[in-house]
């Protein structure tokens, strides 16, 4: 399995964001695929649990992405990607994307760098 | 390194009330949300609730609703746990355990003795 | 809430050997998690997400499953993996752990 991400994302505080995923893959996409999506903060505190799907989505139950996560992607597609809502500066930090689709072999995780940021304010255009 | 440090094991009589603390350190105490599991003698595991460290929401096991309290002191990144009306069937160890990619990283766990 | 089965409840085995532990699901979840503890110590996490490593986890324990019936197998057990084992489900709440399986030295 190869993956591909947009490495870099740039997004406005109070937002949602498509964290982009996508994959290749010799073997055909059937319900052997799972993705699993995790994020690492920017403080370096411990990985946190974002999205799983196998067969159908799961959000998870408990933590700072429940209830504000959803899927985006189409299997059938090669696309893995998901919809983070409501963004926050705290979401600052490393988004990974892992895709295993038996019997092919794991690739390299693919990483998103999301960097959430202020509104622009009238007075700053105004400035540009 | 993340640490969490409950505080020490209590003997309580029927009726009576707990409240066990759970001390983070070595992490951002706020980004994740603090759980507690409670073990009695020999027996498995059952999830009691959890806290929100950011704005104290809850959600709890309804097995417990209307006698356990979770609260937590941002100040002093400590959360707690308090279980009243206890009975025997309440003698547990009780933990306190922060969800990550599962639940990660445990206290080191209270013993609660309910005895007359 | 849902109920989850392990079998066996107890497992003897020797070191070198191949361990497979069963949970059953009382209905569907989307996903397992498998926790290792010994006595007098808090559980440690071993599997998120039913096929995910926890970290420092090493690569003899794997999982697997879907639906009702998931997987915990260690491929050639180590001294130190004689321990109880717990799975739990985190589908929807309450989150809920299974009885345990005693993996002991045969």
């Known amino acids: 399995v190869e993956i591909y991400t947009s490495r870099v994302l740039e997004a406005v505080n109070g937002t949602d964001a498509r964290l982009k995923c996508t994959f290749s893959s010799f073997a055909p996409v059937g319900d052997a695929l799972t993705v699993t999506w995790n994020f690492r903060p920017l403080d370096g505190g411990p990985e946190q649990f974002v999205f799983y799907y196998h067969i159908d989505p799961f959000q998870p139950m408990s933590g700072r992405f429940k209830d504000r996560v959803s899927w985006d992607g189409n299997p059938e597609r090669y696309d893995a990607s998901i919809l983070l809502w409501k963004l926050q500066f705290d979401d600052n930090g490393t988004y990974t994307c892992q895709v295993k689709n038996p019997p092919d072999v794991d690739g390299v995780i693919g990483e998103i760098r999301l960097s959430v940021v202020h509104t622009v304010r009238f007075s700053e255009i105004h400035f540009l | 390194q993340v640490q969490l440090v409950q505080s020490g094991a209590e003997v309580k009589k029927p009726g009576a009330s707990v409240k066990v603390s759970c001390k983070a350190s070595?992490?951002?105490?706020?980004?994740?949300?603090m759980h507690w599991v409670r073990q009695a003698p020999g027996q498995g595991l059952e999830w009691m609730g959890e806290?929100?460290?950011?704005?104290?929401?809850?959600d709890y096991n309804e097995k417990f609703q209307g006698r356990v309290t979770m609260t937590v002191d941002k100040s002093t990144s400590t959360a707690y746990m308090e279980l009243s009306s206890l009975r025997s069937e309440d003698t547990a160890v009780y933990y306190c355990?922060?969800?990550?990619?599962?639940?990660?990283?445990w206290g080191q766990g209270t013993l609660v003795t309910v005895s007359s | 809430e849902i109920v989850l089965t392990q079998s066996p409840a107890t497992l003897s085995l020797s070191p070198g050997e191949r361990a497979t532990l069963s949970c059953r699901a009382s209905?569907?979840?989307?996903?397992m998690y498998w926790y290792q503890q010994k006595p007098g110590q808090a559980p440690r996490p071993l599997i998120y997400?039913?096929?995910n490593r926890a970290t420092g986890i090493p690569a003899r324990f794997s999982g697997s499953g879907s639906g009702t019936d998931y997987t915990l197998t260690i491929s050639s057990l180590e001294p130190e993996d004689f321990a109880v084992y717990y799975c739990q489900q985190w589908s929807s709440n309450p989150p809920t752990f299974g009885q345990g399986t005693k993996l002991e030295i045969k």
């Open positions: 997400v039913t096929s």
């Open positions: 209905s569907s979840v989307g996903y």
């Open positions: 355990t922060i969800y990550t990619t599962a639940l990660d990283y």
């Open positions: 806290i929100n460290p950011t704005n104290g929401g809850t």
């Open positions: 070595g992490y951002t105490f706020t980004n994740y949300w």
